[in-house]
Structures are given as C-alpha cells and as structure tokens.
C-alpha cells in the first residue's frame, strides 16, 4: 500500500517551487498534457548551451514525512536527445541529479541551505532511457521516462527534494512522493493494523476480529516488510467464538442465524438446532429446549433436547402368599433417551382402612428404584392388607421436569391370615375300628376357629380314593370304620373366617387288634 505525500498530477494551482540561480534558462513551470489528456503542472529546463559548471537547481516545497522512514520518489520526465539538437554544445547532458534535504520545519529560503551536495544528500543521477527527437508527425513525441528512487532513512519531520540540471533539455512531468506501508490485513480471523515499516522487517501483533477469540498458542504476529508487503508466514490466528462462524474468506465472524447454533469456539460452521430445541436470536452458542424438553447436565450442549418418558404400561401382578411379582411393559414414549430406569412407590392400607407409605418390612428385588428391567419381586407382604404400587419410568431429564411424574398403578390385596397348622394331635382312645383324636386349639390371628377338617388314610394306601375327610367343630374327632390293627396317617387343619389353614404334620396312629383290649387312651 502506498501513502502519497505529494503528487503533482493532482495539483491544479501553480507549484511555485524554488529555483536557483535566478537567471535565464532556468527551470520554468509550464502547463503540460499527460497520456490521459489531463492538464498537469510541469517543470522544463533547456539550457543546452550553458557555460560549463553552471547548474540549475529546482527544489520542491517542504514535504512532511508522516512517520515514513523511507520515501519513494517516482519521477516522470522527458528528455531531448542531444544529437538531435544542432546548436547543443558538448555540455549538453541527458542526465540530471536528484537530492534531498531534511529539516524539522519549512526553514529553507531562496539561498539556504546552500545549493550543493552536502548539505543536500544525493539520491541518484538519473539517465533517460527514452530520448525525444523531432517529431516525424503527430505521433507520441517521445516515450515518457519513469524512474523511482528511494530516499532515506529519514529522521526529521520533513524534507525537500531537489533536482540539479547541468545541461539537459528536459521536462519533469510529474513527481509522486510516497511511502510504503503494509495495508490493514485480516487473515485467519486476525486483524493486523496498517503498519509503516521502520526497518527491513517489523513484527506486528495481530488482534482477533470482533466475535473471535485467540487460538491456543503464541499470540498471532506477522512481519511487515520495508516494501509494504506482509511477509508470508503461517498465522496461528483466532477462531470464532461460540455462536459465530467464519465468513468472507476467514476475515470475519458471522453470528449464527436464528435456528442454528455453534457450541464451541474454533473452526466449524453453525449447525441447525438439534431436535426439540430452537434459537430465537442470532449468535446462539446453544439452542434452548422447547417447553417440556430438557438437557441433562451431562448431555453435550449440542445434544437434542429430551423429555421424561411416559408411564410404563400393562402392569401385571402375581401374588403368592406374602410375595408379589410385578411385571410391566416399557412406556410408549421413551422421551428420546436411552437411559430409561424404573422406580416404584408403595402405599399400604390396613384392614381397618388407615393407609400409609409402605413400611420397611417390605423388600424389593432387585430394588425399589433404578431398575433397568421391567420387573420386581416384593416380599414381606402382610395378610389382609391392600397395597398400591405406582410404577414410574424415569430418564436422565426426569429430575428437571416439573409437575407430576406419570405412573401406572396396581392394587394388590393380600389374603387374610388363616389359622396355623395343627400339629400336636394325640389319640385319646383306640379300638379295632376307631380312633379318638384331640388337639390343641391353634391361635388364629384373624378371629376364632370355626371348625376343623381331619384328613386321614391307611398307611400304604396313597391314592386319592383312599383319603377320607371328617369335619368337626370341636378340637377332637372320632374316626370310625377303620381296619383292625391297621396304621393310619392323620392330618388336621383349622378354619377361620380367613379360610383353612395348612394341614399339620402327619400323625401316625394304629387301631387295636381285638376287642378285649377295649378302649384305650393313647397319648400321641
């Protein structure tokens, strides 16, 4: 990038530069016409017959250097060919010399600094590549010479440029004074400021563009070269912040559009919001879950939003005494998650009707919660109780939802408790054809014993047809029509309002062989 300090092509008023000495044949300011047919201010000198050693000087106005260390001067000039000038003496030249003089203010006068090399600093002696001859018509009168010179290093506030003619016939068509600077550059989302090089190469620190953040590693820097070019080197730059993506050739970060998001800084573009989420603003790093949908704390920010599952279905209970097997089907809606578990809540109601959460005497296998399989076995149920089990399905976002958790209920009422087994049977009398039995009254938990059932059969006769039953309301019974001298196995059970209790242990009894023995009391 070039920053102009002076460009005579753009000047419309007279330049009014200073000449020395004030004599005929001196540099003269004239109007000219450039290649684009624009009128330009020019300086011409044509003293080809001058006395040897005499020089014509032309000095520009004071030019502030504006921080430039090296300044470039592009000269456009024409020069007549000495050979085509019949009256040109041997002093005719086809060169001229360029000088500069530095100062901290516009202090030069018509006579100072002295018009000579030192104090003026010589830049170069400029020779014409293209010489103008007498026109053979109206075509271009001669190619314009273009020469760029480098001044410096400069240290003072400004400078003058001076031209010394020693016998040329030439015109200075334009002077462009400029310095080179590295233009503001944005690369890899890193902005490097416009920089005037002070040395051969200057390191320049970059800064992240708006909505970008530095990438890990050393802070980005580029080198600005003296020629105004950035030195090519890889840039560990910046990356777009969450909610922003790189755009326009990695020169700026653009906010994610509505309905899209970018969760992390770095490369990558904005993605559509995942299922059941939305972003109503631009620049979203995360999409908000729809009402009723959530992300678990452990879910990635880019994960879809999920919802708690619906209730389990079709709970089936199988009661077996004080044990209950519950089984159910998975919920219709899993909520979009894989981490489905089940839990049970339990209430129990006593026969009298008072209800409370189930007590600690119940055991659940594998457990009351965090069940991954759809079944559980409950043990320790109390008789004649009504149990309500609520089976709920849960997932990773159930804890985030408000409102009631859907459940599938099941009611189970256990049987009332039957009398215990009758086991202490004794034979009070025996005869060849009968046995008189008695037993202790069992302690029935649910009311009095209403009656008893005696089950007996001859030992060795195991078939169903050989088994006989006898009911009695007392805690005794007489078994008649028995075989003489035969062995019998006897069992008794008691009945209360809750039903029959279990048969007790088999009791072994024997009838008498003959009558003479009579009735004999036997103690079991």
């Amino acid at each position: 990038l070039e920053e102009t300090l002076l460009n005579t092509k753009l000047e419309t008023a007279d330049l009014k530069w200073v000449t020395f000495p004030q004599v005929d044949g001196q540099w003269e300011e004239l109007s000219g016409l450039d290649e684009e047919q624009h009128s330009v201010r020019t300086y011409e000198v044509c003293d080809v017959q001058r006395a040897p050693g005499q020089a014509h000087w032309l000095r520009t106005g004071w030019v502030p250097r504006r921080g430039a260390v090296h300044v470039y001067a592009t000269l456009r000039f024409t020069m007549l060919e000495c050979l085509s000038l019949p009256r040109a003496g041997r002093s005719c030249k086809e060169t001229f010399t360029v000088f500069y003089y530095e100062s901290d203010a516009d202090t030069a006068t018509a006579l100072t600094p002295a018009w000579m090399e030192n104090p003026y600093i010589k830049v170069d002696t400029v020779a014409a590549e293209h010489l103008t001859r007498k026109r053979p018509g109206a075509e271009a009168t001669g190619k314009v010479n273009v020469k760029t010179l480098r001044l410096g290093p400069l240290s003072k506030a400004g400078f003058y440029l001076a031209f010394q003619d020693q016998g040329a016939c030439m015109a200075l068509l334009s002077l462009h004074l400029f310095y080179k600077k590295c233009a503001q550059l944005t690369v890899n989302l890193t902005r490097f400021p416009e920089t005037v090089p002070r040395e051969l190469v200057v390191p320049v620190a970059g800064s992240c563009v708006v909505d970008a953040v530095p990438a890990p590693g050393p802070s980005p820097s580029l080198y600005c070269r003296e020629d105004g070019q950035w030195a090519e080197q890889p840039v560990t730059g910046c990356s777009c912040a969450p909610g922003f993506e790189a755009a326009e050739g990695n020169t700026k970060c653009r906010a994610c559009a509505q309905g899209t998001f970018k969760p992390l800084s770095g490369e990558g573009s904005c993605q559509p919001c995942p299922a059941n989420s939305h972003s109503n603003t631009i620049g979203s790093a995360v999409c908000q879950c729809r009402v009723g949908y959530f992300r678990a704390r452990t879910d990635p920010r880019g994960a879809p939003c999920t919802t708690p599952p619906s209730a389990p279905r079709s709970v089936v209970s199988r009661l077996n005494g004080s044990s209950l097997h519950l089984e159910w089907s998975a919920p219709l809606e899993s909520g979009g998650r894989e981490d489905l578990t089940y839990a049970l809540r339990c209430r129990e109601c006593r026969p009298g009707g008072s209800c409370a959460p189930c007590g600690g005497d119940l055991t659940f296998d594998p457990g009351p919660r965090d069940l991954v399989e759809p079944w559980v076995v409950v043990r320790g149920l109390r008789p004649d109780f009504t149990y309500t089990f609520e089976v709920t399905a849960l997932n990773g976002v159930s804890s985030l939802a408000t409102g009631p958790v859907p459940f599938e209920p099941v009611n189970v009422t256990t049987d009332r408790e039957v009398p215990p087994a009758v086991s202490d049977i004794r034979v009070t009398r025996s005869s060849p054809s009968s046995l008189s039995l008695a037993w202790a009254v069992p302690r029935a938990p649910s009311g009095a014993v209403l009656d008893y059932e005696v089950k007996y059969h001859e030992k060795g006769a195991e078939g169903p047809s050989s088994v006989r039953f006898l009911k009695t309301s007392e805690n005794r019974a007489e078994l008649r029509g028995l075989k003489r001298g035969a062995s019998y196995l006897v069992q008794v059970r008691a009945r209360s309002e809750a039903g029959y209790g279990p048969f007790g242990q088999e009791h072994h009894s024997q009838t008498q062989l003959d009558e003479s023995e009579g009735w004999r009391e036997q103690l079991a």
Epitope: S31, G32, K134
Partner: antibody, heavy 126, light 107 residues
Framework: QVQLVQSGAEVKKPGSSVKVSCKAS????????ISWVRQAPGQGLEWMGE????????DYAQKFQGRVTITADESTSTAYMELSSLRSEDTAVYYC???????????????????WGQGTLVTVSS | DIQMTQSPSSLSASVGDRVTITCRAS??????LNWYQQKPGKAPKLLIY???ILQSGVPSRFSGSGSGTDFTLTISSLQPEDFAVYYC?????????FGQGTKVEIK
C-alpha cells in the same frame, strides 16, 4: 500570458521577398512549435510551416516548399518567416502562432495553437 | 497533403439553437484534429484540440467528437458571441492543413 508581437505591414513588389518577424515575450521559447498561417482577404486559413527552435529545421506545407524559409533565434526568442518570389495572390495577413504545449510537456503533439500574433498584412502589388 | 473538407460552408441559426459542423479528412488522422473560431479582423482562437479536449477558458457549450476521418464540432446552445467562422485543423501529418471554414450567421 505569453505574447507574440509581429512586425508591421509590408507592401512588396511581385518577385520580391518579405521577412516577417514574431517575437515571443517571457519564458520558454525553444521547445514550443511556432507555426505560420496566412489568410488571404475573404479566404480561409492556410498553414505554411512550423519550427521548433531547439531543433533548428522547419517543416513546410508542400505548396510553399522552396519559396518559404522559417527560422528562429533562441537568443532573442524571435521567429522569422521569409517568403520569396512574391505574387499578387500572396497578398494576405500572415500570422505566427505558438503551440499550447512544449514538445517536452505533451505526450501527443497536437500542435494546437493557442497563442497568436496580431497578424502582419503583406500586400504584393506592382 | 491531407485534405480537410468542412460542411456546411455556411449556416444560419438563431440564439439557443444546437449547431453541428462536420469535418472530413481525406485519410485517417486518428484524433489529431483541432477546432478554431475566428471573428472578423481577429486572429483565430483555439476551441478544441485532440478532437474532443476543450481548451482552458472555452465555454462548455462547445464540444468535439470523432476519430479517424469524420469529426464534429457541436455548439449545444448558440449564443450571440458565437457567430463567427469555424475551422478544423489536422496535425497528423508533418504538413498541417485547415478546412475551408464554416460561417455561422444570424438567421
């Protein structure tokens, strides 16, 4: 503004010669083209020739070749046009004119004449 | 020499009229053509050079166009001071030539 001042009116006999001068005041002279243009009474303009003083030699219209001589003196910034073998049809106002730009300060030489002398009437009569 | 033919030789027009004068070269002269205005008893005045470049100080109602062999001078809105004779002038050759002139008179 440069001025071109021409010599005064002349009355000449047929067969004679006339030399008209054109003095440029102020500034560069050598690198401008100086043209001579004549205008017979009631007629149009007629280009006769031109000189760029620094180059010395002039260019002439074919019609006047051999009869006209254009010269320049850089030391006095004066151009001259001499026409010989005068005839009555050479009666005219003779103008000198300077080009808008020097040969060095224009990319294309349009030889556009933006400075004119006041004209010199030359009458050829026996 | 290159011949320059102007047309018309003369024309009558009123103030405010748009006036067009043409000039034809006998061979290609690119854009090396100038236009001059001359009033009676005065030296010619340069109006346009290079076919279309307006000379400094000339009113913008004057314009020129053309290249090669056909050229035009246009006065967009004729003013009282514009009544004069107009000449084209080619400088393509080492030998310049003028057109014969076009007289613009008051109607």
């Amino acid at each position: 503004q440069v001025q071109l001042v021409q010599s005064g009116a002349e009355v000449k006999k047929p067969g004679s010669s006339v030399k008209v001068s054109c003095k440029a005041s102020g500034g560069t002279f050598s690198t401008y083209a100086i043209s001579w243009v004549r205008q017979a009474p009631g007629q149009g303009l007629e280009w006769m020739g031109e000189i760029i003083p620094i180059f010395g030699e002039a260019d002439y219209a074919q019609k006047f070749q051999g009869r006209v001589t254009i010269t320049a003196d850089e030391s006095t910034s004066t151009a001259y046009m001499e026409l010989s073998s005068l005839r009555s049809e050479d009666t005219a106002v003779y103008y000198c004119a300077r080009s808008s730009y020097t040969i060095l300060t224009t990319y294309y030489n349009y030889n556009a004449m933006d400075n004119w002398g006041q004209g010199t009437l030359v009458t050829v009569s026996s | 020499d290159i011949q320059m033919t102007q047309s018309p030789s003369s024309l009558s027009a009123s103030v405010g009229d748009r006036v067009t004068i043409t000039c034809r070269a006998s061979q290609n002269i690119n854009n090396f053509l100038n236009w001059y205005q001359q009033k009676p008893g005065k030296a010619p005045k340069l109006l346009i050079y290079g076919s279309s470049i307006l000379q400094s100080g000339v009113p913008s109602r004057f314009s020129g166009s053309g290249s090669g062999t056909d050229f035009t001078l246009t006065i967009s809105s004729l003013q009282p001071e514009d009544f004069a004779v107009y000449y084209c002038h080619q400088v393509s050759d080492t030998s310049d030539t003028f057109g014969q002139g076009t007289k613009v008179e008051i109607k």
